[in-house]
């Protein structure tokens, strides 16, 4: 059985303030069953940005239909980017459980925010 990998192809993404940012993430396997979550940062302050299964994230939308069978694209789009959104974002695969268990993290994508073009 091939080991699950979580791939974030871009090391960095630069977006102008007010635009949308697309953060790409794919998984190499559907197994084991469990959600993908997106976080900003690592350690104690790690901030939940998007949860595939629960929560309310008004500025974040999945790029691909998460309900589609065999979907392995977990990319997200964050709308109306501001300088406060800068940081390193991680796509993380969890195994379903109570609670869910973290399995594998992508390498991270650093989002930088450029000034709005005048």
């Amino acid at each position: 059985e091939e080991e699950l990998q979580v791939i974030q192809p871009e090391k960095s993404v630069s977006v102008a303030a007010g635009e949308s940012a697309t953060l790409n993430c794919t998984a190499t396997s559907l197994i084991p069953v469990g959600p993908i979550q997106w976080f900003r940062g690592v350690g104690p302050g790690r901030e939940l940005i998007y949860h595939q299964k629960e929560g309310h994230f008004p500025r974040v939308t999945p790029v691909s239909d998460p309900t589609k069978r065999n979907n392995m694209d977990f990319s997200i789009r964050i709308s109306n980017i501001t300088p406060a959104d800068a940081g390193t974002y991680y796509c993380v695969k969890f195994r379903k459980g109570s609670p869910d268990v973290e399995l594998k993290s992508g390498a991270g994508t650093e989002l930088s925010v450029r000034a709005k073009p005048s």
């Epitope: 940062g41 350690g43 929560g55 940081g87």
Partner: antibody, heavy 117, light 108 residues
């Protein structure tokens, strides 16, 4: 406005237990890391424990195995269960919201824990 | 563990003076330093993060600078409400997060 309100402090004997609570409002609690920071009388600040937005837990060495941090996202509440308390645990315990890059942007007013016989 | 050393321990100054507080780290922390102000009987308040970024609502007289292992907090013209204890905190290595011992700024 972000508000953090601690409760549960008090006087306890060495070896005893206490559970601190921190009720949060003004932000989406479940998405953010939360922490406990303490300050012994007349001393500086010491980070004690944290629970990240993913529910991972972290402790400073001196409390590992004695303190347990937990959270109830449905109640917007952070807890610190303190067991086997020692005199050196006497301090004001502050609840603080942790930013994504690990500093503290909002603090509660603190609750005093006194460990004495 | 990253150890932060603040100096001086106490600073006696007059209102209107310029004040510079120093925080030294035991190893490089890539500019990941925060500064807090604490007045007697109050909780700490975030002033500066990422060495030089002012937190929301913090007056322009507070500024931070530094890189590598040496960082400074400067208050350009000390106001009466600025007499307090100031702490630095590194947010580079979170195992564990550590604070400096504090600098007390008192009225001369």
């Amino acid at each position: 406005d972000v508000q953090l309100v601690e409760s549960g402090g008090g006087l306890v004997q060495p070896g005893g237990s206490l559970r601190l609570s921190c009720t949060a409002s003004g932000f989406t609690f479940r998405n953010y890391g939360m922490s406990w920071v303490r300050q012994a009388p007349g001393e500086g600040l010491e980070w004690v424990s944290a629970s990240s937005g993913s529910g991972s837990t972290y402790y400073t060495d001196s409390v590992k195995g004695r303190f347990t941090i937990s959270r109830d996202n449905s109640k917007n509440t952070l807890y610190l269960q303190m067991n086997s308390l020692r005199a050196e645990d006497t301090a004001i315990y502050y609840c603080a919201k942790v930013t994504w890059n690990n500093f503290f942007d909002y603090w509660g007013l603190g609750t005093l824990v006194t460990v004495s016989s | 563990e990253i150890v932060l050393t603040q100096s001086p321990g106490t600073l006696s100054v007059s209102p209107g003076e310029r004040v510079t507080l120093t925080c030294r780290a035991s190893q490089g922390i890539a500019g990941k330093i925060a500064w807090y102000q604490q007045k007697p009987g109050q909780a700490p308040r975030l002033l500066i993060y990422d060495a030089s970024s002012r937190a929301t609502g913090i007056p322009g007289r507070f500024s931070g600078s530094g890189s590598g292992t040496e960082f400074t907090l400067t208050i350009t013209s000390l106001q009466s409400e600025d007499f307090a204890v100031y702490y630095c905190q590194q947010h580079y290595d979170w195992s564990p997060l550590t604070f400096g011992g504090g600098t007390k700024v008192e009225i001369k």
